[in-house]
C-alpha cells in the first residue's frame, strides 16, 4: 500500500464508522457499479506501524456491506488504513481504501429505548449493553428529549460509571391526557452532527388525582 | 511530495472576522484530518482543534470555542479556520498539519495574522 | 488540561558534542491502547515545525540516527549524540494521547 497516493478523489464506495449498541461498525456503499459484488474482503494495516494488510476474519468473503470491527480496532487514537475488496465469483471487481481515526470519524447511534406513560410522568428505560469497553465510551453524554405542543425539553442525565446495562429516566413533572414524545441520542463532547433516534410517544392517562413520582435525576 | 499551501499573510482591523486556507496536495486529501495549531511568542504553540477531512467532524480545544471555526471543501482538498471577533491576541502566525490518527507529521508554512487599527 | 514541561529553556553546545532534553507532562501519557503518544518536534529559524519523533522513540523518515527518544509515563528525554550545525532551532514535545493536545514551552538549541 501507498499511505501517500497522489490526490485522486474518484472513490468508488463510500464509508461511515459508527458505533451501534457501544460496536464499532463499519458500513459501506458503492458508487457506479454496473456489477455488483457477489462477496466483499476487509483488509486493515495501522499507520503508525504499517505491516501487511490484515484480512478481518468475520469480514473475510462477506456477503454483508457492513463489519464489526470492535475486537479488531481498539485504540482511538491509530489511523487504520482500510482497503475493501469486491469480489464476484471469483474475479476481484474492485478495491477500495480508506483510513479511519476513530476519535473523529465515528459518528453515534442512538441507543434503543422504551417509554411507558403514567399519569404525570415517563419512564424512559434505555438499553445498553451489559459491558462497554473503556475506549468505546468516547466521552459520551446521554441526552433524552421531551416534546410536547411544539415545546422541546432537553434531559441530560448523569450516569455514574459506564454506559452499561439497562438505564431508566423518569421524566416528571407532566399534564395528564396530554401527547408527549420522547427521543434519545448519544452527545459527543464537540458540537459533532448528532443522530436522533426517532420518536416514540404516548398519550398520557387522564388524572384521576396528583401523583408524585420520585425523579431519578 | 506531501505539500500543505496556507493562504497568505492577513491584516486585519480589530472586531472582524479572518478565514484562512490550508490546501493538502500530494496524498489523498481526505484520507488525513487537518489539525490548526497557534503559534505566539508569548504562549508557544496552542493546539486550536481538528476536522476529519471525510466526514467534516471536529474537535476543539475548549478555550478556541467561539473564536475558531474549521470547515473543509473535499473538492478542492482545502481546510479553513475562520477566527472571531479578532484581537491584539490573534496576532500570531497560524499552522496547519495533517495527521493520520493522533499523529501529526507534515505542517503547512503558516499564516501570519496582523491585527491593527 | 495536560501541562508539558520542557528544560532547559535554552541549550548551548559545541558542534560534534552531545545534547540532551527533558520533556515531563503532568499525567500519564500511556494510552489504554498501549502506546505513548509523545512526539517531538523541531522548528528551525524562519521555518515551520517539522516531525522529529513520534511514539516516543521511532524516528520520522529522513531524521539522523544520532536523534534518539526514549521515556514512559510522564518522563521523556531526546538526546541528539553529536550535535551538528543543522540542529539549531528549537525542539518542542506534544502530547496527542489526551484532547486536547498540548505542547511543550520549547527548548532553544544554540551552537556554541
Known amino acids: 500500500i501507498s499511505y501517500d497516493s497522489p490526490d485522486y478523489t474518484d472513490e468508488s464506495c463510500t464509508f461511515k464508522i459508527s458505533l451501534r449498541n457501544f460496536r464499532s461498525i463499519l458500513s459501506w456503499e458503492l458508487k457506479n457499479h454496473s456489477i455488483v459484488p457477489t462477496h466483499y474482503t476487509l483488509l486493515y494495516t495501522i499507520m503508525s506501524k504499517p505491516e501487511d494488510l490484515k484480512v478481518v476474519k468475520n469480514c473475510a468473503n462477506t456477503t454483508r456491506s457492513f463489519c464489526d470491527l470492535t475486537d479488531e480496532w481498539r485504540s482511538t487514537h491509530e489511523a487504520y488504513v482500510t482497503v475493501l475488496e469486491g469480489f464476484s465469483g471469483n474475479t476481484t471487481l474492485f478495491s477500495c481504501s480508506h483510513n479511519f481515526w476513530l476519535a473523529i470519524d465515528m459518528s453515534f447511534e442512538p441507543p434503543e429505548f422504551e417509554i411507558v406513560g403514567f399519569t404525570n410522568h415517563i419512564n424512559v428505560m434505555v438499553k445498553f449493553p451489559s459491558i462497554v469497553e473503556e475506549e468505546l465510551q468516547f466521552d459520551l453524554s446521554l441526552v433524552i428529549e421531551e416534546q410536547s405542543e411544539g415545546i422541546v425539553k432537553k434531559h441530560k442525565p448523569e450516569i455514574k460509571g459506564n454506559m452499561s446495562g439497562n438505564f431508566t429516566y423518569i421524566i416528571d413533572k407532566l399534564i395528564p391526557n396530554t401527547n408527549y414524545c420522547v427521543s434519545v441520542y448519544l452527545e459527543h463532547s464537540d458540537e459533532q452532527a448528532v443522530i436522533k433516534s426517532p420518536l416514540k410517544c404516548t398519550l398520557l392517562p387522564p388524572g384521576q388525582e396528583s401523583e408524585s413520582a420520585e425523579s431519578a435525576k | 511530495q506531501v505539500q500543505l499551501q496556507q493562504s497568505g499573510p492577513e491584516l486585519v482591523r480589530p472586531g472582524v472576522s479572518v478565514k484562512i486556507s490550508c490546501k493538502g496536495s500530494g496524498y489523498r486529501f481526505t484520507d488525513y484530518a487537518i489539525h490548526w495549531v497557534k503559534q505566539s511568542h508569548a504562549k508557544s504553540l496552542e493546539w486550536i482543534g481538528v476536522?476529519?477531512?471525510?466526514?467534516?467532524?471536529?474537535r476543539y480545544n475548549q478555550k478556541f470555542k467561539g473564536k475558531a471555526t474549521m470547515t473543509v471543501d473535499k473538492s478542492s482538498s482545502t481546510a479553513y479556520m475562520e477566527l472571531a471577533s479578532l484581537t491584539s491576541e490573534d496576532s500570531v502566525i497560524y499552522y496547519c498539519a495533517r495527521s493520520g490518527g493522533s499523529l501529526m507529521d507534515y505542517w503547512g508554512q503558516g499564516t501570519s495574522v496582523t491585527v491593527s487599527s | 488540561d495536560i501541562v508539558m514541561t520542557q528544560t532547559p529553556l535554552t541549550l548551548s553546545v559545541t558542534i560534534g558534542q552531545p545534547a540532551s532534553i527533558s520533556c515531563k507532562s503532568s499525567q500519564s501519557l500511556l494510552d489504554s491502547d498501549g502506546k505513548t503518544y509523545l512526539n517531538w518536534l523541531l522548528q528551525r529559524p524562519g521555518q515551520s515545525p517539522k516531525r522529529l519523533i513520534y511514539?516516543?522513540?521511532k524516528l520520522d523518515s529522513g531524521v539522523p540516527d544520532r536523534f534518539t527518544g526514549s521515556g514512559s509515563g510522564t518522563d521523556f528525554t531526546l538526546k541528539i549524540s553529536r550535535v551538528e550545525a543543522e540542529d539549531l532551532g528549537v525542539y518542542y514535545c506534544?502530547?496527542?494521547?489526551?484532547?486536547?493536545?498540548?505542547f511543550g514551552g520549547g527548548t532553544k538549541l544554540e551552537i556554541k
Open positions: 476536522i476529519s477531512t471525510y466526514y467534516g467532524n471536529t
Open positions: 506534544w502530547q496527542g494521547t489526551h484532547f486536547p493536545y498540548t
Open positions: 511514539l516516543v522513540s
